[in-house]
Interface confidence: medium
């Protein structure tokens, strides 16, 4: 299925920088195919617009949002519509397009630049140089030995997975990076477009653990688009 | 296991100041953000400041902004407020709060009277 | 401002099930899917109850459960006891700029 295809629980499926640098070694961050998206059941070109079916965001492109067609349509009808633009009316942030979240109702600026070199700052903390970027690899290849003596314990800083004890990942929360629980079954889980709202993304889940893909509830498909849950499921 | 301990409150007149510590112990205090959240008697909580591990990384609430100041001392182990300018709506009780899986482990609180 | 709105009161039986909810706006609850729930008994300090929305920290009851629909979460306690009795505040998080944002606090009464 697309689910599966695309199994992609928060650091998984990020672009960079925010979600750090892509294929790089060590990093549980990787990022998706910049090519293809999926509109509706089949992936689609970018410049090859047109309304799929949808059941949720997710399933539209990155400048898409799904929702009926029609004002107070049947909600059982939902199509890709074009992504809203700033100080344009909204419901969510998935409503606005890239650069832009929802806030009382009303798309604005994400103001990327500020957000971006916030976290940047954060994450590179440990290094004492406030301006490394995420994409300085130089800089993340080592954690500062004097701040990890040992695998980081949950609610820990960390600069990647492996920095992580068993059983923990490495994730964003807050303005910086730390070791959270892998997901359980039953859990909740967040499966990802390539959107530029991830920058307002502070707060990352884990993978689902082994055996299990992120998937929505069973016994959600029939509610409202806004309370679909994905879960850790078997296989 | 995790242990935050406030100090430093007290009674203070309006536009006076106060410096609020907790020290922290049971964990590694410089791998993790802290925080601290107010609740004036009767009332909810508030979040007041939180600070990032290495201290370089501040945000606080339109409340205090410009009036307190939030710092850290790792190899204290201790979190501080520096409150200035106090108002009398600033009367709380202080708690510092480690932020990890959000704010998951806090302290018992040190109380703040702002009167003449 | 961003507010969280919660109902000042609430209160059950013994064994029974009770909810609390938590309205938001698209910026926090239900921009983010991410809600805490906290536990406050009286002098004492909040316990981080629920995180991200459905899970539980080590050591907190099973009876405790969160769920999250829109721009509404909820904390539902099952099998009520004397000492749930307390207050909760849901918890969530602003973009613009980032800061924690509190609901007003529900006042949990365990009935008879």
């Known amino acids: 299925t697309l689910n599966s295809v695309l199994n992609s629980n928060a650091i998984k499926n990020l672009p960079p920088p925010l979600g750090g640098a892509a294929g790089h070694p060590g990093s549980a961050v990787s990022a998706a195919p910049g090519i293809l998206y999926p509109g509706g059941n089949k992936y689609q070109t970018i410049d090859n617009y047109q309304p799929y079916p949808c059941a949720e965001d997710e399933e539209c492109g990155t400048d898409e949002y799904c929702a009926s067609p029609t004002r107070g349509g049947d909600a059982g009808v939902q199509i890709c519509l074009a992504c809203r633009k700033r100080r344009k009316r909204c419901m969510r942030h998935a409503m606005c397009c890239p650069g832009n979240y929802c806030k009382n109702g009303i798309c604005v600026s994400s103001d990327q630049n500020n957000f971006r070199g916030e976290i940047e700052e954060t994450i590179t903390e440990s290094f004492g140089n406030d301006h490394s970027t995420l994409d300085g690899y130089s800089r993340r290849t080592t954690l500062s030995s004097k701040m990890y003596h040992s695998k980081g314990q949950e609610g820990s800083v960390c600069l990647r997975s492996s920095d992580c004890a068993t059983g923990l990942c490495c994730a964003r929360h807050f303005w910086s990076k730390i070791c959270k629980p892998v997901l359980k079954e039953g859990q909740v889980c967040t499966k990802h477009r390539r959107k530029g709202s991830h920058g307002l993304e502070i707060f990352q889940r884990c993978y689902c653990g082994e055996g299990l893909s992120c998937r929505i509830q069973k016994d959600h498909h029939q509610a409202s688009n806004s309370s679909r849950l994905h879960t850790c499921q078997r296989h | 296991q995790v242990q935050l301990v406030e100090s430093g409150g007290g009674l203070v007149q309006p536009g006076g100041s106060l410096r609020l510590s907790c020290a922290a112990s049971?964990?590694?205090?410089?791998?993790?953000?802290m925080s601290w959240v107010r609740q004036a008697p009767g009332k909810g909580l508030e979040w007041v400041s939180g600070i990032s591990y290495s201290g370089s990384n501040t945000h606080y609430a339109d409340s205090v902004k410009g009036r307190f100041t939030i710092s850290r001392d790792n190899s204290k182990n201790t979190l501080y407020l520096q409150m200035n300018s106090l108002r009398a709506e600033d009367t709380a009780v202080y708690y510092c709060?480690?932020?990890?899986?959000?704010?998951?482990?806090w302290g018992q609180g040190t109380l703040v009277t702002v009167s003449s | 401002d961003i507010a969280l709105t919660q109902p000042a009161s609430v209160s059950g039986s013994p064994g029974q099930s009770i909810t609390i909810s938590c309205t938001g706006t698209s910026s926090d609850v239900g921009g983010f899917n991410y809600v805490s729930w906290y536990q406050q008994h009286p002098g004492k300090a909040p316990k981080l109850m629920i995180h991200?929305?459905?899970n539980r920290p080590s050591g907190v009851s099973n009876r405790f459960s969160g769920s999250k629909s829109g721009n509404t979460a909820s904390l539902t306690i099952s099998g009520l006891q004397a000492e749930d009795e307390a207050d909760y505040y849901c918890?969530?998080?602003?973009?613009?700029?980032?800061?924690?944002?509190f609901g007003g606090g529900t006042k949990l009464t365990v009935l008879g």
């Open positions: 991200d929305g459905s």
């Open positions: 918890q969530s998080w602003d973009v613009s700029p980032i800061t924690a944002v």
């Open positions: 049971g964990f590694t205090f410089s791998s993790y953000w």
């Open positions: 709060a480690r932020m990890g899986i959000d704010l998951d482990y």
